[in-house]
């Protein structure tokens, strides 16, 4: 999937199966990555977990699970807010769209977190103060922890000379992440995809044509679309939301 | 202690949360202060030694002499409040200020810094 | 989550002394009044005391008054009971509660007055 | 001081099985307000007493809702609808209307 992370790095991975995305002392999100088609190096979110860990008179601990084809309302146990204690609505779930958007508010961390359905896989979208970000006990073990550290360099997929390839008359498939490239769906029509609902030609942008080059799946272009959308609502610096391609940092840093 | 189920429905009974009530809202702020104050006077029996009664009290106490409220009056009606859908747990509820992280957070220092990760696509 | 931990519990003779030390954590201390309460070997429980949350006021049972303090020291996080003139009755483990009405306890430590 | 007496003192019951502990007070509980300030703690074999219910009924946070209270003036009483092993103890009441504050007797769970 695609990486925005805390420090406005913004990477296209490879992960696959269970990665943390946050993990600090208070939450811990972990995402499961599948390959989207087979035999592809890319992947997207099939699975999404949450754990809001016990917080003082606030809140007991609650799990959120999605799946593909599974966006609950409600925490594992069936709860909306965070359980018994004075603060419990200090946490609370609001389903925006049923099936396809979810919001979860945790006033107690001043965190907002937006997950969706679209298509097939889910997108995961976070507010949270840095304090609560930077709030780790073991600082050792941040080393995999996506959203701050972003992911590990061997799991970064170059789309940029992905694109490069692509924007080229012949394609050749070894230039692609994905043996299985759909033919069908030409650059020029994953650009003009892509141009509808994303007329800055930022990042999201790019990944929307990347997404489309390597799926054919025209719901990726919704993935790119929400996810600007979603950083429009919880961004607290409006300059920084769109993100243009720089040029390549060194191998060791965090991209 | 059910100090904060006073303290909640004193700010929502004075809508906005302000302590500066315009003019001709003062003999309804003064109701809903007499309501809070015999609120807090209940949970004495088991809130009497935190923090949060005492700051209530004093509070209560504040207010009542800026807004020349009397002792003696109407209290307001607490409002009708829709039920939490079957199945949620609201026992307990009332959000604590430490539940509440950016009014906390506002006592100590500045408005906190606040930064935004995604994923999506492929 | 929080968490109450009682030491300085021991043997001590009757007519003695003992300090019994009440660590908090998991929550903010300084917010809350707190209490002691003993159970007697085989027996059942019996309050001993409350302090409030800025050590404003005390309340003791009169079983104990004059003899024990409860004081607190907030930037510690740390609840203490002073017990003297101690005699066998006060035999027991004594535990220290979070709130002005005792929501969660400590493990407790035992206190055995005996010659 | 107010006096609460529990019975039965000792309560063996069968798994599944619904149990009933009373507590009487030697004097009313209900304040001039109207409220009750009557709790219920457990203590399980070798534990510290951990808080189930508060102000006559109320559950506390994490308690199952098998566990009931209900009740007021003096009379008031502690329900298990289905008792399961864990719920082996003592389980006490407590008043918080009068000073000093004071316990039950305690009443004995043991499985059947």
């Known amino acids: 999937p695609h990486l925005r992370t805390f420090t406005d790095h913004f990477q296209t991975c490879k992960v696959q199966g269970a990665w943390p995305l946050i993990d600090n002392n208070y939450l811990n999100v972990q995402v499961t990555n599948t390959p989207v088609l087979p035999g592809s190096a890319a992947t997207a979110t099939s699975k999404l977990t949450i754990i809001f860990k016990n917080f003082q008179e606030c809140v007991d601990q609650k799990v959120y699970q999605a799946e593909m084809d599974e966006l609950p309302s409600a925490f594992a146990d069936g709860s909306k807010n965070g359980g018994d204690k004075h603060g419990a609505n200090s946490l609370k779930i609001t389903e925006k769209v049923s099936g396809q958007h979810v919001e979860i508010q945790a006033k107690y961390i001043g965190t907002t977190i937006v997950v969706r359905q679209v298509g097939r896989y889910l997108t995961f979208a976070v507010r949270m103060p840095e304090e609560v970000v930077n709030a780790v006990e073991d600082r050792d073990s941040q080393g995999l922890y996506l959203c701050l550290r972003g992911c590990p360099l061997n799991q970064q997929i170059d789309f940029q000379a992905f694109r490069a390839n692509a924007e080229s008359p012949r394609r050749p498939a070894a230039a692609s992440p994905s043996p299985v490239v759909p033919e069908t769906f030409p650059y020029e029509t994953a650009v003009a995809k892509c141009k509808e609902k994303l007329p800055v030609e930022d990042l999201y942008y790019q990944a929307c044509v990347f997404d489309l080059l390597t799926t054919g799946d025209v719901n990726f272009t919704l993935a790119a679309y929400y996810a600007l959308e979603d950083g429009k609502m919880l961004h607290s610096n409006k300059d920084k939301l769109h993100l243009f391609e720089r040029t390549r940092e060194l191998p060791g840093a965090v991209a | 202690c059910k100090i904060l189920k006073c303290n909640s429905e004193f700010w929502s009974a004075t809508s906005s949360g302000s302590h500066a009530p315009a003019s001709d809202d003062v003999p309804e702020f003064c109701a809903a202060l007499r309501t809070y104050a015999l609120c807090t006077r209940r949970t004495a029996r088991t809130c009497r030694g935190d923090l949060a009664y005492h700051s209530a009290v004093h509070g209560i106490e504040d207010l009542m002499s800026q807004h020349n409220c009397s002792k003696d009056g109407p209290t307001s009606q607490p409002r009708v409040r829709t039920l939490p859908p079957a199945g949620d747990s609201q026992e307990r509820s009332d959000s604590p200020e430490i539940c509440h992280y950016e009014k906390s957070f506002h006592k100590h220092s500045a408005a906190p810094n606040y930064t935004h990760c995604g994923l999506f696509g492929d | 989550e929080v968490q109450l931990v009682e030491s300085g519990g021991g043997l001590v003779q009757p007519g003695g002394s003992l300090r019994l030390s009440c660590a908090a954590s998991?929550?903010?201390?300084?917010?809350?009044?707190m209490n002691w309460i003993r159970q007697a070997p085989g027996k059942g429980l019996e309050w001993i005391g409350m302090?409030?949350?800025?050590?404003?006021?005390?309340h003791y049972a009169d079983s104990v008054k004059g003899r024990f303090t409860i004081s607190r020291d907030n930037s510690k996080n740390t609840l203490y009971l002073q017990m003297n003139s101690l005699r066998a009755e006060d035999t027991a483990v004594y535990y220290c509660?979070?709130?002005?009405?005792?929501?969660?306890w400590g493990q407790g430590t035992m206190v055995t007055v005996s010659s | 001081d107010v006096v609460l007496t529990q019975s039965p003192l000792s309560l063996p019951v069968t798994l599944g099985q619904p149990a009933s502990i009373s507590c009487r007070s030697s004097?009313?509980?209900?304040?001039?307000?109207?409220?009750?300030?009557l709790e219920w703690f457990q203590q399980r074999p070798g534990q510290s007493p951990r808080l189930l219910i508060y102000?006559?009924?109320s559950r506390f946070s994490g308690v199952p809702d098998r566990f009931s209270g209900s009740g007021s003036g003096t009379d008031f009483t502690l329900k298990i609808s289905r008792v399961e092993a864990e719920d082996v103890g003592v389980y006490y009441c407590m008043q918080v209307t009068h000073d000093p504050l004071t316990f039950g007797q305690g009443t004995k769970l043991e499985i059947k």
């Open positions: 102000e006559v009924s």
């Open positions: 302090i409030y949350y800025d050590s404003s006021e005390k």
């Open positions: 998991g929550f903010t201390f300084s917010n809350y009044g």
């Open positions: 004097q009313s509980l209900e304040t001039s307000d109207g409220d009750t300030f």
């Open positions: 509660a979070k709130g002005t009405t005792p929501d969660y």
